[in-house]
């Protein structure tokens, strides 16, 4: 590499990749193996993450920009460049520091992240059920009551709801 | 620099016993949970167990239960896994990995990860 011959600052002219190496009369310097520089200027290169554990390479390290990670399956990221991995879990289920555990009766996950929410509750609309909730689903809500008078709608209203056990935990 | 190294991995009958250990350095090892996770060929990573900070609290996937045991040295900033009545399932990479910054607060992320060691499981 050329020895850099700014005025102000010698190490303004080293490019990415580079750094400005002060053992070597600040001349510069590629980055060494395993290291990146992802702007000019730099007097040190940055240690390249390493993707470990159930962390896997989506983008290799090179000398002008760090290596990206995302998560084996059976793993999602969380964090800003992905920067932890959190376990999936099934439909119906919520993650807890115990695991994996079913929605309680009344709420559903219908993701393999997040946690359990509340089904809707059709009346605060003033509308009926008209499916059932289920671990992994909403209810669907129906049309009012009031809508279902004989000769309104030809929608049949549904059977009582019968409760499931509550699920376990 | 963080770092997390396993060992005790090995070749073992159904039925037989290992205990496997993780190194931890370079962090406060006593302010983390900690976690075994593994991940057996052609399948999916599953979280094995987690262990809170001083060792008070312990918890494992249902598949576990009864016959591993997670513990935690903080002295020593050490991790375990004591592995008892094993079976060809159990066949897999286990990771020593600690849990995230807010581990336990609705997000159960874990940031920083071993390389792993290799149970075996066979007659």
């Known amino acids: 590499f050329e020895r850099t011959r700014s005025l102000q600052d010698p190490c303004s002219n080293c490019p990415a990749g580079t750094f400005c190496d002060n053992n070597r009369n600040q001349i510069c310097s590629p980055c060494p193996p395993n290291s990146f520089s992802s702007a000019g200027g730099q007097r040190t290169c940055d240690i390249c993450r390493q993707c470990k554990g159930v962390f896997r390479t989506r983008k290799e390290c090179s000398s002008t920009s760090n290596a990206e990670c995302d998560c084996t399956p059976g793993f999602h990221c969380l964090g800003a460049g992905c920067s932890m991995c959190e376990q999936d879990c099934k439909q119906g289920q919520e993650l807890t520091k115990k695991g994996c555990k079913d929605c309680c009766f009344g709420t559903f996950n219908d993701q393999k992240r997040g946690i359990c929410r509340p089904w809707t509750n059709c009346s605060l609309d003033g509308k009926s059920v008209l499916v059932n909730g289920t671990k992994e689903r909403d209810v669907v809500c129906g049309p009012s009551p009031a809508d279902l008078s004989p000769g309104a709608s030809s929608v049949t209203p549904p059977a009582p709801a019968r409760e499931p056990g509550h699920s376990p935990q | 620099e963080v770092q997390l190294v396993e060992s005790g991995g090995g070749l073992v009958q159904p039925g037989g016993s290992l205990r496997l250990s993780c190194a931890a350095s370079?962090?406060?090892?006593?302010?983390?949970?900690m976690n075994w996770v593994r991940q057996a060929p052609g399948k999916e990573a599953e979280w094995v167990a987690n262990?809170?900070?001083?060792?008070?609290?312990?918890y494992y996937v249902d598949s576990v239960e009864g016959r591993f045991t997670i513990s935690r040295d903080n002295a020593k900033n050490s991790l375990f896994l004591q592995m008892n009545s094993l079976r060809d399932e159990d066949t897999a990479v286990y990771y020593c990995?600690?849990?995230?910054?807010?581990?336990?607060?609705?997000?159960?992320?874990?940031?920083?990860w071993g390389q792993g060691t290799t149970v075996t499981v066979s007659s």
């Open positions: 990995a600690r849990g995230g910054p807010d581990y336990g607060d609705l997000h159960y992320g874990m940031d920083v």
């Open positions: 370079g962090f406060t090892f006593r302010s983390y949970w």
């Open positions: 262990i809170n900070q001083d060792g008070s609290e312990k």
